[in-house]
């Protein structure tokens, strides 16, 4: 297992609709054809997996149908979008990149992006 540098923004504020996008960029030492990207959430020293996708270079990222993540890839960059976020989901979202094929296997873990989320103000009651 070889180490690889992964860069991501330190802080992102989610939109009022609970959507946050950020780029996860990895310094690929070779010509990987199969890449796995995992998003981990760290909150109060607990780490949980948010979503993961494996993709072939040049193809779209495919997350599970019920995943809250979507993404696109371009070269050594992965543009990740997490939706359905609420205030309670505020936390550090860490990008983990694995170069699966061809060997050697490389692993890189970013420092994390702190995503701040605020619940939208409830709409005032209307008479309609």
């Amino acid at each position: 297992c070889k180490a690889m540098h992964v860069a991501q923004p330190a802080v992102v504020l989610a939109s009022s609709r609970g959507i946050a996008s950020f780029v996860c960029e990895y310094a690929s030492p070779g010509k990987a054809t199969e890449v796995r990207v995992t998003v981990l959430r760290q909150a109060d020293s607990q780490v949980t997996e948010v979503c993961a996708a494996t993709y072939m270079m040049g193809n779209e990222l495919t997350f599970l149908d019920d995943s809250i993540c979507t993404g696109t890839s371009s070269g050594n960059q992965v543009n990740l979008t997490i939706q359905g976020l609420r205030a309670m989901d505020t936390g550090l979202y860490i990008c983990k990149v694995e170069l699966m094929y061809p060997p050697p296997y490389y692993l890189g873990i970013g420092n994390g992006t702190q995503i701040y989320v605020i619940d939208p103000e409830p709409c005032p009651d209307s008479d309609f």
Epitope: V11, V12, L13, S15, S21, D44, T90, Q114
Partner: antibody
Amino acid sequence: QVQLVQSGPEVKKPGASVKVSCKASGYTFTSYGIGWVRQAPGQGLEWMGWISAYNGNTNYVQKFQGRVTMTTDTSTSTAYMELRSLRSDDTAVYYCARVGASGVDYWGQGTLVTVSS
Amino acid sequence: EIVLTQSPDFQSVTPKEKVTITCRASQNIGSSLHWYQQKPDQSPKLLIKYASQSFSGVPSRFSGSGSGTDFTLTINSLEAEDAATYYCHQSSSLPFTFGPGTKVDIK
């Protein structure tokens, strides 16, 4: 090293607007946010809101909603805070501060805004 | 919004004495509590982040502890240059908030 340099002092009349700038250096501007905090004479620190330089999204404290606008110019690594319909109780030192994972870490030197007729 | 309360409001201390300042949050904020020092006519400076982690360049006499709702800033062996107002700040949820401050002066 991280530096935030703010624009100079302002004297404004009630009802006017003020726009304070904050030029950042020493780090990747778009990786962080810029928050704005004010401090009235002899008082504590009051959080006004912040902007994510990464995507331009903003979060304002309800008290200032509709009266404040925070923007960034990523080409010059500069953040701006505009406060409208100024009142005498808006007289304060206005600070910009970098927002990181651990809240606010680095601060500008402050800009004194005096509202007086 | 999360309300932070600090105690005491004011403390007059002799040099080399130990100072303890507490900050209480109105709800659980985990460890997302940070401490700042502000000297007269200066900008605030970060001392402690995430309740107990010293910020770079901060003297070792400053330390922090706590989690959840109760937090403490300790200055071991106070020095004359530590005369300042100390603020706690939470980044657990938006909007961010500050405590009202604790003024420390030297006897």
